[in-house]
Amino acid sequence: GELETSDVVTVVLGQDAKLPCFYRGDSGEQVGQVAWARVDAGEGAQELALLHSKYGLHVSPAYEGRVEQPPPPRNPLDGSVLLRNAVQADEGEYECRVSTFPAGSFQARLRLRVLVPPLPSLNPGPALEEGQGLTLAASCTAEGSPAPSVTWDTEVKGTTSSRSFKHSRSAAVTSEFHLVPSRSMNGQPLTCVVSHPGLLQDQRITHILHVSFLAEASVRGLEDQNLWHIGREGAMLKCLSEGQPPPSYNWTRLDGPLPSGVRVDGDTLGFPPLTTEHSGIYVCHVSNEFSSRDSQVTVDVLDPQEDSGKQVDLVSAS
């Protein structure tokens, strides 16, 4: 007869491991007992369990409640055992020693490999601001056994760097994603992808990029200066900018307070029917946590009675 087992049994942390040991004997041969021991190099054999044809299953105190025989029906030549709820410390070499009649004793070894799936974590880097150089966007760390693979999935252009720390029974892998921040990256997904043999599918953690910026400010509404004449209704100036975080707008008049009747509505300055007192220099002040910008325009309300139109100056400053 001969013993049938596996060279390696692989199980995921927390699952039950079946340690196979089957005696394929000639007809009339009987298995008296099967002794299972852990036999890691440099250490003596440590009892796991004893399956006896008459006495039944004996489990070592160290494995009490964790070793069982496979559910019935059981072949009397099958000395396999189940190791419940495998933990990392169970990883190692195991031996089954089979006593048969009349053929004598046989033994076989197998290696139990316990896969520890990673629980990845993604940590965003410092706040991203347009104008910075190469900056850490995010780091992703995953620890497992064996070492997991950590990669990035994104449309954003950047560079990656990885480092690994080996522990006694596992390895932690950290990958960093660096980029040169630009406003076009705003709202773009940056996904950490972790692969491991203990995972049914890759684990993905997505981080949405936020790049702080503030665009130059400009004022719209004075494109046709001939429309700015006494008596015109619905005249308005609109301040144009964009930013992250979204900016706030403030209107002032450089040469005095805003005339009465002028309404400020965020980025828009609304005028009542125009009079000459509405002529002046208006300043749009745009700001967010990242920066601030100004744009000023000169409004000159025309008197249709006068022959010649007035010149309108647009000045932008930041």
């Epitope: 007992q33 002794a35 021991a37 004893l50 006896h52 006495y55 039944g56 299953l57 105190p61």
Partner: antibody
Framework: EVQLVESGGGLVQPGGSLRLSCAAS????????MSWVRQAPGKGLEWVSR????????HYADSVKGRFTISRDNSKNTLYLQMNSLRAEDTAVYYC????????????????WGQGTLVTVSS | DIQMTQSPSSLSASVGDRVTITCRAS??????LAWYQQKPGKAPKLLIY???SLQSGVPSRFSGSGSGTDFTLTISSLQPEDFATYYC?????????FGQGTKVEIK
């Protein structure tokens, strides 16, 4: 025929010592785990100690730990129990018994017993 | 340590009676249970090993059953030579422990 014959019992004062012997014959002594079991007058059976056949490692009941020592001489097919610091509660018939080692520290039932030797601890 | 609880502690029966003695272990011991018979002034004699296996030379009127924690010794038809004290013993763990014994007396 398997035979186990105990000797060495007798009357001893509290605090005294005694050495029991168990002569084995009719089987391969060195292949078996050997135990001492005692029975106080009118009481039940109490396991005392056991010695392993493979490496001579020993186990003791808490009640005798540190006072009793089990040993064996495979060349003489003899089991011993050295009893020191004897107490009145050690008074009992002492039996030696054999059991087959299955594996590790797992044994069969004790299939053969000696006739016993009486130890009396009294002043 | 595993506690072995035997019941009854004594019983009276007549020749030809069916006698049942039970033994309960404080935790599972598979079939690592033996039954012994002891007569006054004599050494214990192994009757049943592995909970239900009859030791060689023991009459077939003796039988054992059970597994795990609950075990039974049955004498199908009590004979005059069966009046004795019976002990169960677990040898699943060290220390092996005995039940307190059941004395079978003549009614």
């Amino acid at each position: 025929e398997v035979q186990l014959v105990e000797s060495g019992g007798g009357l001893v004062q509290p605090g005294g010592s005694l050495r029991l012997s168990c002569a084995a014959s009719g089987f391969n002594f060195s292949n078996y785990g050997m135990s001492w079991v005692r029975q106080a007058p009118g009481k039940g059976l109490e396991w005392v100690s056991r010695i392993k056949p493979t490496d001579g490692s020993t186990h003791y009941a808490d009640s005798v730990k540190g006072r009793f020592t089990i040993s064996r001489d495979n060349s003489k097919n003899t089991l011993y129990l050295q009893m020191n610091s004897l107490r009145a509660e050690d008074t009992a018939v002492y039996y030696c018994a054999r059991a087959e080692l299955l594996a590790f520290d797992v044994y069969t039932a004790s299939d053969y017993w000696g006739q016993g030797t009486l130890v009396t601890v009294s002043s | 340590d595993i506690q072995m609880t035997q019941s009854p502690s004594s019983l009276s029966a007549s020749v030809g009676d069916r006698v049942t003695i039970t033994c309960r272990a404080s935790q599972g011991i598979s079939s690592y249970l033996a039954w012994y018979q002891q007569k006054p002034g004599k050494a214990p004699k192994l009757l049943i090993y592995a909970a239900s296996s009859l030791q060689s030379g023991v009459p077939s009127r003796f039988s054992g059953s059970g597994s795990g924690t609950d075990f039974t010794l049955t004498i199908s038809s009590l004979q005059p030579e069966d009046f004795a004290t019976y002990y169960c013993q677990q040898h699943y763990t060290t220390p092996p422990t005995f039940g307190q014994g059941t004395k079978v007396e003549i009614k």
